[in-house]
């Protein structure tokens, strides 16, 4: 067909952005292109074309009219991770093609098992006490907090320091005695460790 004067090659006007999404949740990678004739949009992940509902109506990925890629739910197993990776959208018409910036889709995870549960501690009043835990593996890296007797620990108390997985009480009081739980949290949710007992003995 003849080149029409008003026709022009595709250009990407909205590039996809990096995403971190929880497994099972919906997600959208945006892509918008201009061109005349209106360009077709295809998505590629790691160099392989991404199958969508246009290829298989049962697909959990949908190519939206705008050109965006919509995931009905992010699929992510212990081994198979078909949705995680680096994506680009490619807009094409007879005058050429335009490729978007790379966008990484990462899947947030939070495993169940603590790498280290805190242990029971017994100290005398006035002595320091240290409890340590290593939260489950997670992405993003889980933050750590502590609960005492089921309630969040008051880390505004200047005697209490939480650094990494360590809970340090510089000078214990009788009232510090109780059941402590380490809590690992990220966007997926939170996990609680096994209970550790702090016993504070009278001198």
């Amino acid at each position: 067909s003849r080149l029409r004067q008003e026709d022009f090659p595709p250009r990407i006007v909205e590039h996809p952005s990096d995403l971190i999404v929880s497994k099972g949740e919906p997600a959208t990678l945006n892509c918008k292109a201009e061109g005349r004739p209106t360009p077709t949009i295809e998505w590629y992940k790691g160099g392989e074309r991404v199958e969508t509902d246009k290829d298989d109506p049962r697909s959990h990925r949908m190519l939206l009219p705008s050109g965006s890629l919509f995931f009905l739910r992010i699929v992510h197993g212990r081994r198979s991770k078909p949705d995680e990776g680096v994506y680009v959208c490619v807009a094409r018409n007879y005058l050429g093609e335009a490729v978007s910036h790379n966008a990484s889709l990462e899947v947030a995870i939070l495993r169940d098992d603590f790498r280290q549960n805190p242990s029971d501690v017994m100290v005398a009043v006035g002595e320091p006490a240290v409890m340590e835990c290593q939260p489950p593996r997670g992405h993003p890296e889980p933050t750590i907090s502590w609960k005492k007797d089921g309630s969040p620990l008051d880390d505004k108390d200047e005697r209490i320091t939480i650094r990494g997985g360590k809970l340090m009480i510089t000078y214990t009081r009788k009232s510090d005695a109780g059941k402590y739980v380490c809590v690992g949290t990220n966007m997926v949710g939170e996990r609680e460790s096994e209970v550790a007992e702090l016993t504070v003995l009278e001198r």
């Epitope: 992940k45 790691g46 392989e48 991404v50 199958e51 290829d55 298989d56 699929v75 992510h76 197993g77 212990r78 081994r79 198979s80 991770k81 078909p82 949705d83 990776g85 169940d112």
Partner: antibody, heavy 118, light 105 residues
Framework: EVQLVQSGAEVKKPGASVKVSCKAS????????MHWVRQAPGQGLEWMGW????????NFPQKFQGRVTMTRDTSITTAYMDLSRLRSDDTAVYYC???????????WGQGTMVTVSS | DIVMTQSPSSLSASVGDRVTITCRAS??????LNWYQQKPGKAPKLLIY???SLQSGVPSRFSGSGSGTDFTLTISSLQPEDFATYYC???????FGGGTKVEIK
């Protein structure tokens, strides 16, 4: 349509090797682990191992280590299973199966009958 | 290795019966348990994944339950097309149960 199509039936002599292929289509080949499972006549299912089509990494149960090789060619979206030093008790239907993101075998090949006989 | 023990190995039932098949793991596998149906000369077909989730396109008369070491597949009202062999599979490290053949009484 998502499917796995396997190579045809084979008849082999004891001591020989067999290579079974599994052509994947309709999905992103490198996104899903591929497993191999076999079934001797009248018997149950036996897992033989997996390959990560993205990296080529493999994992096998102790029973098959040293005798089974799993490879893939991403350019033609095909996985291969090579079993060496064949014995009569290797006579079975060999299946490839895709492991879904839900940790289950959601798509299976049609099976390849391998007969080992002198 | 995690050993999966399925019971019974075979059972006879009539159309309309409620059928229960059990699967026991030799150690805890959380909910990493799947169920498959296999008919003679055919590849297995996924019915239930993650112990209790129904695979797309599978009739709702099939259900799964359990976690840890003990799991159950239930067919609420057996249909003629359900006569087949059923396998459990743990996907924690991957192995299959021995199978349960469901035959016509």
């Amino acid at each position: 349509e998502v499917q796995l199509v396997q190579s045809g039936a084979e008849v082999k002599k004891p001591g020989a090797s067999v290579k079974v292929s599994c052509k994947a289509s309709g999905y992103t080949f490198t996104g899903y682990y591929m497993h191999w499972v076999r079934q001797a006549p009248g018997q149950g299912l036996e897992w033989m191992g997996w390959i990560n089509p993205n990296s080529g990494a493999t994992n096998f149960p102790q029973k098959f280590q040293g005798r089974v090789t799993m490879t893939r060619d991403t350019s033609i979206t095909t996985a291969y299973m090579d079993l060496s030093r064949l014995r009569s008790d290797d006579t079975a239907v060999y299946y490839c199966a895709r492991e879904s993101g839900d940790d289950a075998f959601d798509i299976w090949g049609q099976g390849t009958m391998v007969t080992v006989s002198s | 290795d995690i050993v999966m023990t399925q019971s019974p190995s075979s059972l006879s039932a009539s159309v309309g019966d409620r059928v229960t098949i059990t699967c026991r793991a030799s150690q805890s596998i959380s909910s990493y348990l799947n169920w498959y149906q296999q008919k003679p000369g055919k590849a297995p077909k996924l019915l239930i994944y993650a112990a209790s989730s129904l695979q797309s396109g599978v009739p709702s008369r099939f259900s799964g339950s359990g976690s840890g070491t003990d799991f159950t597949l239930t067919i609420s009202s057996l249909q003629p097309e359900d006569f087949a062999t059923y396998y459990c599979q743990q996907s924690y490290s991957t192995s299959f149960g021995g199978g349960t053949k469901v035959e016509i009484k």
